[in-house]
């Protein structure tokens, strides 16, 4: 004969555990029903009656099958530097993540506790490592032959234009100025250079790195429009 299915509440066999979505109530010494996500235990079970569940109130939630007497409070509203990526419902907590241009400086179990603005690299510096959801931008000086004249959390160092005749040589924060109306060519059309490592120039030197520590500094990417004027914001 098949084993009889026990309905909650029931006394478990000695040494056995309660079934999935049930819990053992120490007071009643019975296996009782858990409440579903979005509910909580309004009345605990007895030897003769099962758990009475009730829906979570506004701004509270339970995410798991449970027997908690009260639902958990949803986190406070997202701050101005955050966006709500998951709303507070009866079954899930609100999740706040950092808005574009910011990163999470202090995370919590889900979402972010403290957002901070992404660092903006000043002229002469380019983005060496872009910001992520959880890490800030890393700025490094532009290598010889490259420049950045913007203040930006996204702009990398770009190659100086190459002139037939140079009127003003380029430096880390300024492009070369040509005497002719147009430069002969740009350094490898479409080439965009990350700031480091730096090779030798009059004031800018570096010991030759080991091959394993010298990342490629040239990435072929489509070139964007010419940058804003010196000191303007590039993002």
């Amino acid at each position: 004969l098949p084993a009889q299915v026990a309905f909650t509440p029931y006394a478990p066999e000695p040494g056995s555990t309660c079934r999935l979505r049930e819990y053992y109530d120490q007071t009643a010494q019975m296996c009782c029903s858990k409440c579903s996500p979005g509910q909580h235990a309004k009345v605990f079970c007895t030897k003769t009656s099962d758990t009475v569940c009730d829906s979570c109130e506004d701004s509270t939630y339970t995410q798991l099958w449970n027997w908690v007497p009260e639902c958990l409070s949803c986190g406070s509203r997202c701050s101005s530097d955050q966006v709500e990526t998951q709303a507070c419902t009866r079954e899930q907590n609100r999740i706040c993540t950092c808005r574009p241009g910011w990163y999470c400086a202090l995370s919590k179990q889900e979402g972010c506790r403290l957002c901070a603005p992404l660092r903006k690299c000043r002229p002469g510096f380019g983005v060496a490592r872009p910001g992520t959801e959880t890490s800030d931008v890393v700025c490094k000086p532009c290598a010889p032959g490259t420049f950045s004249n913007t203040t930006s959390s996204t702009d990398i160092c770009r190659p100086h234009q190459i002139c037939n005749v140079v009127a003003i040589p380029g430096n880390a924060s300024m492009d070369a100025v040509c005497t002719s109306t147009s430069p002969t060519r740009s350094m490898a059309p479409g080439a965009v250079h990350l700031p480091q490592p730096v090779s030798t120039r009059s004031q800018h030197t570096q010991p030759t790195p080991e091959p394993s520590t010298a990342p490629s500094t040239s990435f072929l990417l489509p070139m964007g429009p010419s940058p804003p004027a010196e000191g303007s914001t590039g993002d």
Epitope: K120, G124, F125, R129, P141, Q206
Partner: antibody, heavy 119, light 107 residues
Framework: EVQLQQSGPEVGRPGSSVKISCKAS????????MHWVKQSPGQGLEWIGW????????DYAEKFKKKATLTADTSSNTAYIQLSSLTSEDTATYFC????????????WGQGVMVTVSS | NIVMTQSPKSMSMSVGERVTLTCKAS??????VSWYQQKPEQSPKLLIY???NRYTGVPDRFTGSGSATDFTLTISSVQAEDLADYHC?????????FGGGTKLEIK
């Protein structure tokens, strides 16, 4: 907490060299370049140059190209300045200062090292 | 090289007075000017960056302003602990340069 701890005072003979250190803690050493700044007694501040600990690349003010050598050791999170061919003009306090590449080149400073050149 | 000229060289003020220090750049440095406070026998500390941004923990009596070539540091109500040398510096182009400093004495 970001800290830049510099080595103790140095006395050097004219013509000799000294090497002073700046040990960084409280941040990722390779994410920031390190500047060195000179302050002669009763004088203003003079920028010497910077070293990028990640790549060992450097840049110097013209005046200090033959005088100073900047290096960094990532295993100990320490930046160094070596001053060569010392003269009385090199008697000064030397500061290291961190730079994140954003608005200000010098957001944290070491406490400074007094170098005295005397025969 | 960009020359940064600070004035006055020194000044003596009473507690509670308003102090204005100026810094002039020989070329346009946009807003890449910082102000540093150096108390006797100490290293410089960053007060203002980007011409007008107060650094973390700096009292709000310190205010920076200006752009291009003319910059000002104002202490709205000077305190005894503000006795120090004040340096301006440009971080716009190499070589980075500083003003000669202003020595602030308290009467």
């Amino acid at each position: 907490e970001v800290q830049l701890q510099q080595s103790g005072p140095e006395v050097g003979r004219p013509g000799s060299s000294v090497k002073i250190s700046c040990k960084a803690s409280g941040y990722t050493f390779t994410d920031y370049i390190m500047h060195w700044v000179k302050q002669s007694p009763g004088q203003g501040l003079e920028w010497i140059g910077w070293v990028d600990p990640e790549y060992g690349s450097t840049d110097y003010a013209e005046k200090f190209k033959k005088k100073a050598t900047l290096t960094a050791d990532t295993s100990s999170n320490t930046a160094y300045i070596q001053l060569s061919s010392l003269t009385s003009e090199d008697t000064a306090t030397y500061f290291c200062a961190r730079d994140d590449g954003s608005y200000s080149p010098f957001d944290y400073w070491g406490q400074g090292v007094m170098v005295t050149v005397s025969s | 090289n960009i020359v940064m000229t600070q004035s006055p060289k020194s000044m003596s003020m009473s507690v509670g007075e308003r102090v204005t220090l100026t810094c002039k750049a020989s070329e346009n440095v946009v807003t890449y000017v910082s102000w540093y406070q150096q108390k006797p026998e100490q290293s410089p500390k960053l007060l203002i960056y980007g011409a007008s941004n107060r650094y973390t923990g700096v009292p709000d009596r310190f205010t920076g302003s200006g752009s291009a070539t003319d910059f000002t540091l104002t202490i709205s109500s000077v305190q005894a602990e503000d006795l120090a040398d004040y340096h301006c510096g440009q971080g716009y182009s190499y070589p980075y340069t500083f003003g000669g400093g202003t020595k602030l004495e308290i009467k």
